[in-house]
């Protein structure tokens, strides 16, 4: 099949890093500077991505693979292949159209990205709040209030030991 395909289409023989050059009677030509083809049989080479501005080069372009970008400090990647850079906020904040804003009471964000999320409602699981939530941290749920009521302890104290052979007076 491979042989049949290459007889029909000379371009199928062109390896990665080359393209099938119509201007040269469909012979394989190396990709021109600052372009690449990551698979064989390409009819053109793609222009290398340039990591400019808030983007930073994570991997240089080569004739067989595109450049890869990440974001400069203070920003983080969004989208497939880091197509966008979004500003970091502090923990306890979220990014709005007006910039970084503190989380509203009852919500938290423990990362530099993303939105503020509501504290866990411990009572939904029949539990009590062990540690209060903050803007940066969720609440910590503890045992249910019933578990904490006097006399409801699940730990029973050991019975006092008696010496053998002695009856109580």
């Amino acid at each position: 099949f491979e042989r049949t395909r290459s007889l029909q289409d000379p371009c199928s023989n062109c390896p990665a890093g080359t393209f099938c050059d119509n201007n040269r009677n469909q012979i394989c030509s190396p990709c021109p500077p600052n372009s690449f083809s990551s698979a064989g049989g390409q009819r053109t080479c793609d222009i290398c991505r340039q990591c400019k501005g808030v983007f930073r080069t994570r991997k240089e372009c080569s004739s067989t693979s595109n450049a890869e970008c990440d974001c400069t400090p203070g920003f983080h990647c969004l989208g497939a292949g880091c197509s966008m850079c979004e500003q970091d906020c502090k923990q306890g904040q979220e990014l709005t159209k007006k910039g970084c804003k503190d989380c509203c009471f009852g919500t938290f964000n423990d990362q530099k990205r993303g939105i503020c999320r509501p504290w866990t409602n411990c009572s939904l699981d029949g539990k009590s709040v062990l540690v209060n939530g903050t803007k940066e941290r969720d609440v910590v749920c503890g045992p249910s209030p019933a578990d904490l009521s006097p006399g409801a302890s699940s730990v029973t104290p050991p019975a006092p030991a008696r010496e053998p052979g002695h009856s109580p007076q």
């Epitope: 890093g17 190396p30 021109p32 240089e60 372009c61």
Partner: nanobody
Framework: AVQLVESGGGLVQPGGSLRLSCAAS????????WSWYRQAPGKQRELVAW???????HYTDSVKGRFTISRDNTKKTLYLQMNSLKLEDTAVYYC?????WGQGTQVTVSS
């Protein structure tokens, strides 16, 4: 424009070696892609070995491990070291620098 002149071709037995040279004249310093092609009788010209613009050497599958492309920028010369030559390597070998071609040098592998 850049002028290219190949040399080093000849008749060699199977398993033998040859070293092709391609002397360039003119302003070669802006050129970043250098290639060797070959054309066997009745066949299409094919890319054999090349320096990509990122300075990495590449080879077509049929010559990998046998041919080595190199260059000497001070001498403005591109080379193709061909070892373990086979009958099917018989062709006219051409040097190419982006838009310029040499006149070719004949390599014949025959017993």
């Amino acid at each position: 424009a850049v002028q290219l002149v190949e040399s080093g071709g000849g008749l060699v037995q199977p398993g033998g070696s040859l070293r092709l040279s391609c002397a360039a004249s003119g302003n070669i310093f802006s050129i970043r892609v250098w290639s060797w092609y070959r054309q066997a009788p009745g066949k299409q010209r094919e890319l054999v070995a090349w320096f990509a613009w990122d300075n990495i050497a590449h080879y077509t599958d049929s010559v990998k491990g046998r041919f080595t492309i190199s260059r000497d920028n001070t001498k403005k010369t591109l080379y193709l070291q061909m070892n373990s030559l086979k009958l099917e390597d018989t062709a006219v070998y051409y040097c190419n620098s982006e838009d310029s071609w040499g006149q070719g040098t004949q390599v014949t592998v025959s017993s």
